[in-house]
Interface confidence: low
């Protein structure tokens, strides 16, 4: 037989020879870092047909690292379901906790002993530094230096020095989340005031007031003979502008240019009809009505447009 087979986990005892006689036996031992578990054989014999009898290194097992218990409030997860050298241990913390130390430990062979590459980490409660202070406002628990996971603070705005109040833009409550990061950006406090919304040939039907602050909502409908170009509902946004923009009431023109309607008064605006005259945003005329400045239209009263501070 020629040289005997080589294995990953076991090695020949003694020096190999160039050839072996029939019936000659060779013995193996487990390599450094492996240990023998009976009963499998660790020897082979040169057979009559000049081949070695079957043998495997299945009896030699990798050395294993010491057992690691789960960290408090977390888990130790053997990456390959084994503590054998050459493999990793992954550490995971429960929700609301974070790792102090190495997330992965490696089982390493030092001489013939398998040891971990470092100390197991610990799972520490997620802590947040105080949330941002905001201009013209404050948050609850302002005296607290360290916040724990899911601890929440609520922002509120200071009283304004002028006639218009500060509005809170954004979410008033934020909480201490994963990675010691607050759940969202802090809100802001500022004066938000939208101009008085005037719709010519139309009227406000809800949201009445002299001043319109953040999130003020106004609804409109058009006078008879006019239809709404835009949204019937507008909201005062954080930039002190109406969103969507203040609509217009445009005159309903006859559907064809042949004859004007016989009626001399405004076209009916019954909401049950689906005509272009409807104040709801229903079907529009097949052509865009011209926007004209008809003389004699009532102008908004002086001073009704509230200028922004």
């Amino acid at each position: 037989c020629e040289e005997p087979p080589t294995f990953e986990a076991m090695e020949l005892i003694g020096k190999p020879k160039p050839y072996y006689e029939i019936g000659e036996r060779v013995d193996y031992k487990c390599k450094k870092g492996y240990f023998y578990i009976p009963p499998l054989a660790t020897h082979t014999i040169c057979d009559r047909n000049h081949t070695w009898l079957p043998v495997s290194d299945d009896a030699c097992y990798r050395e294993t690292c010491p057992y690691i218990r789960d960290p408090l409030n977390g888990q130790a997860v053997p990456a390959n379901g084994t503590y054998e050298f050459g493999y990793q241990m992954h550490f995971i913390c429960n929700e609301g906790y974070y790792l102090i130390g190495e997330e992965i430990l490696y089982c390493e062979l030092k001489g013939s002993v398998a040891i971990w590459s470092g100390k197991p980490p610990i799972c520490e409660k997620v802590l947040c530094t105080p949330p941002p202070k905001i201009k013209n406002g404050k948050h609850t628990f302002s005296e607290v230096e360290v916040f724990e996971y899911l601890d929440a603070v609520t922002y509120s705005c200071d009283p304004a020095p002028g006639p218009d109040p500060f509005s809170l833009i954004g979410e008033s409550t934020i909480y201490c989340g994963d990675n010691s990061v607050w759940s969202r950006a802090a809100p802001e406090c500022k004066v938000v005031k939208c101009r008085f919304p005037v719709v010519e040939n139309g009227k406000q039907i809800s949201g009445f007031g002299k001043k319109f602050y953040y999130k003020a909502t106004v609804m409109f409908e058009c006078d008879k003979g006019f239809y709404l170009d835009g949204s019937d509902t507008i909201v005062c946004d954080s930039n002190s502008t109406w969103d969507p923009p203040v609509p217009k009431c445009l005159k309903v023109l006859p559907p064809s240019s042949t004859k004007p309607p016989a009626l001399s008064h405004s076209v009916s605006t019954s909401s049950t009809t689906k005509s272009p005259a409807s104040s709801a945003s229903g079907p529009r005329p097949t052509y865009k009505p011209p926007v004209s400045n008809y003389p004699g239209y009532p102008k908004p009263e002086e001073g009704i447009l509230d200028s922004l501070d």
């Epitope: 102090i100 610990i122 530094t129 230096e145 990675n179 010691s180 990061v181």
Partner: antibody
Framework: QVQLVQSGAEVKKPGASVKVSCKAS????????ISWVRQAPGQGLEWMGW????????NYAQKLQGRVTMTTDTSTSTAYMELRSLRSDDTAVYYC???????????WGQGTLVTVSS | DIVMTQSPLSLPVTPGEPASISCRSS???????????LDWYLQKPGQSPQLLIY???NRASGVPDRFSGSGSGTDFTLKISRVEAEDVGVYYC????????FGPGTKVEIK
């Protein structure tokens, strides 16, 4: 390996401001926080405050509240500490150190001497 | 605020001999997770501080095993089993349970 390299020494007049930088390398800057610690001549160590390089959250020592501002620039992996309205007792070596709240300072900068003198 | 005290403030040592530094906190540093939030730092002459021991008794990476930390609650000890010349400097304990406060330091010098 982890390295924190600080800006050079500064001499300032009382009432002025100073801004010290701390450039980090050898680790993911945004995964850690930076604390600032100072040491007056011949004295012990005093923790000044902490900033998260992840989200910029800060936590300052009560004694320095209102005079100190800590910031980070993640594009250059640099932390900054600005101290305003300097007084003579602010003369100290200022250190940056890597760490989180409730964790150890496992890496320190070489220190920046700030001298406040009229 | 948690106040940290150390004793002695000055410690003359003989190379090869053991040395011990005590640190006390004004309130317990034992967290509910079973770990003590106390670190030891060494500041060698003209250098930045370096971490020696974390969480009361764990040696930081690269720290020789002649350094050991012990204690729990409010009383802690740093021991050097055999002092070497390179161990001279100021040793600080620091609590990390509520923000951070350092002890006044213990100056270790060769006799």
């Amino acid at each position: 390996q982890v390295q924190l390299v600080q800006s050079g020494a500064e001499v300032k007049k009382p009432g002025a401001s100073v801004k010290v930088s701390c450039k980090a390398s050898g680790y993911t800057f945004t995964s850690y926080g930076i604390s600032w610690v100072r040491q007056a001549p011949g004295q012990g160590l005093e923790w000044m405050g902490w900033i998260s390089a992840y989200n910029g959250n800060t936590n300052y020592a009560q004694k320095l509240q209102g005079r100190v501002t800590m910031t980070t620039d993640t594009s250059t992996s640099t932390a900054y500490m600005e101290l305003r309205s300097l007084r003579s007792d602010d003369t100290a070596v200022y250190y940056c150190a890597r760490g989180f709240p409730r964790t150890s300072f496992d890496s320190w900068g070489q220190g920046t001497l700030v001298t406040v003198s009229s | 605020d948690i106040v940290m005290t150390q004793s002695p403030l000055s410690l003359p040592v003989t190379p090869g001999e053991p040395a011990s530094i005590s640190c006390r906190s004004s309130q317990s540093l034992l967290h509910s997770n079973g770990y003590n939030y106390l670190d030891w730092y060494l500041q060698k002459p003209g250098q930045s501080p370096q971490l020696l021991i974390y969480l009361g008794s764990n040696r930081a990476s690269g720290v020789p095993d002649r350094f050991s930390g012990s204690g729990s609650g409010t009383d802690f000890t740093l021991k050097i089993s055999r002092v070497e010349a390179e161990d001279v400097g100021v040793y600080y304990c620091m609590q990390a349970l509520q923000t951070f406060t350092f002890g006044p330091g213990t100056k270790v010098e060769i006799k």
